[in-house]
């Protein structure tokens, strides 16, 4: 028969035949041959894989290091990564909590709406159309843009959610 | 290296006046958003008071607010906290940062204690 160009879900494609990938919590050891099973063998303690997959190494799971401030929110199985959070009173500056702030800053193109309180961490907000922020901060809120008018002046760049309008001088008729 | 120094702390009576500074290194002083926070005994962290990186924004915890002002010399990289009307509550290991405030980073704080 034609050797397999594709092989179904869960599987995958070596020496022209179609494997069982191994579990999740389980990792590879030696390939399927003609007369053999993928031969699979499962994660040692703080080790996972989350996926089906042909990894010959397990991942070591994630450290929460106390000296960033990092505690275990859920220990890690053989299929799944531990999770980290902050100690309390403080914040993870990043969905993947890799370290910790006493409150989280606003990015550019974001304004604080409320300042962070001893419970709750800073609400950020994206700035509306005719208000911009260019720094990241745990205080300031979107400014508005420059108006030109009242200077007497006109639009020469459009202002963003990021940057202020540049206002400059109106364009004078020539005679 | 980052390095924060806080410096000014003392006994005072309530009532009375401290004023406290901070010297930075490591950074670019004039570009950063600072802030103060305390820890008074046996409790977690509190923020004081922020100044933006220019100097002309100023924000206060409601609980020093009218009392306490922040303020910078961009020229000398160093943070104030000028502190007024002290109160018995207002006893805290005061530290200065830059933002945001990190766990792994508070630098050496002053201690301010206000007693009579």
């Known amino acids: 028969p034609e050797p397999p160009t594709a092989c179904r879900e869960k599987q995958y494609l070596i020496n022209s035949q179609c494997c069982s990938l191994c579990q999740p919590g389980q990792k590879l050891v030696s390939d399927c041959t003609e007369f053999t099973e993928t031969e699979c063998l499962p994660c040692g303690e703080s080790e996972f894989l989350d996926t089906w997959n042909r990894e010959t190494h397990c991942h070591q799971h994630k450290y929460c290091d106390p000296n960033l401030g990092l505690r275990v929110q859920q220990k890690g199985t053989s299929e799944t990564d531990t999770i980290c959070t902050c100690e309390e009173g403080w914040h993870c500056t990043s969905e993947a909590c890799e370290s910790c702030v006493l409150h989280r800053s606003c990015s550019p193109g974001f304004g604080v709406k409320q300042i962070a309180t001893g419970v709750s961490d800073t609400i950020c907000e994206p700035c509306p159309v005719g208000f911009f922020s260019n720094v990241s901060s745990a205080f300031e809120k979107c400014h508005p843009w420059t108006s030109c008018e009242t200077k007497d002046l006109v639009v020469q760049q459009a202002g963003t959610n990021k940057t202020d309008v540049v206002c400059g001088p109106q364009d004078r008729l020539r005679a | 290296e980052v390095q924060l120094l806080a410096s000014g702390g003392g006994l005072v009576q309530p009532g009375g006046s401290l004023r406290l500074s901070c010297a930075a290194s490591g950074f670019t002083f004039p570009q950063e958003e600072m802030i103060w926070v305390r820890q008074a005994p046996g409790k977690g962290l509190e923020w004081v008071s922020a100044?933006?990186?220019?100097?002309?924004?100023?924000y206060y915890a409601d609980s020093v607010k009218g009392r306490f002002t922040i303020s910078r010399d961009n020229s000398k990289n160093t943070l104030y906290l000028q502190m007024n009307s002290l109160r018995a509550e207002d006893t805290a290991v005061y530290y200065c940062?830059?933002?945001?405030?990190?766990?792994?980073?508070w630098g050496q704080g002053t201690l301010v204690t206000v007693s009579s």
């Open positions: 940062g830059k933002e945001p405030f990190r766990y792994d980073y």
């Open positions: 100044i933006s990186g220019s100097g002309g924004s100023t």
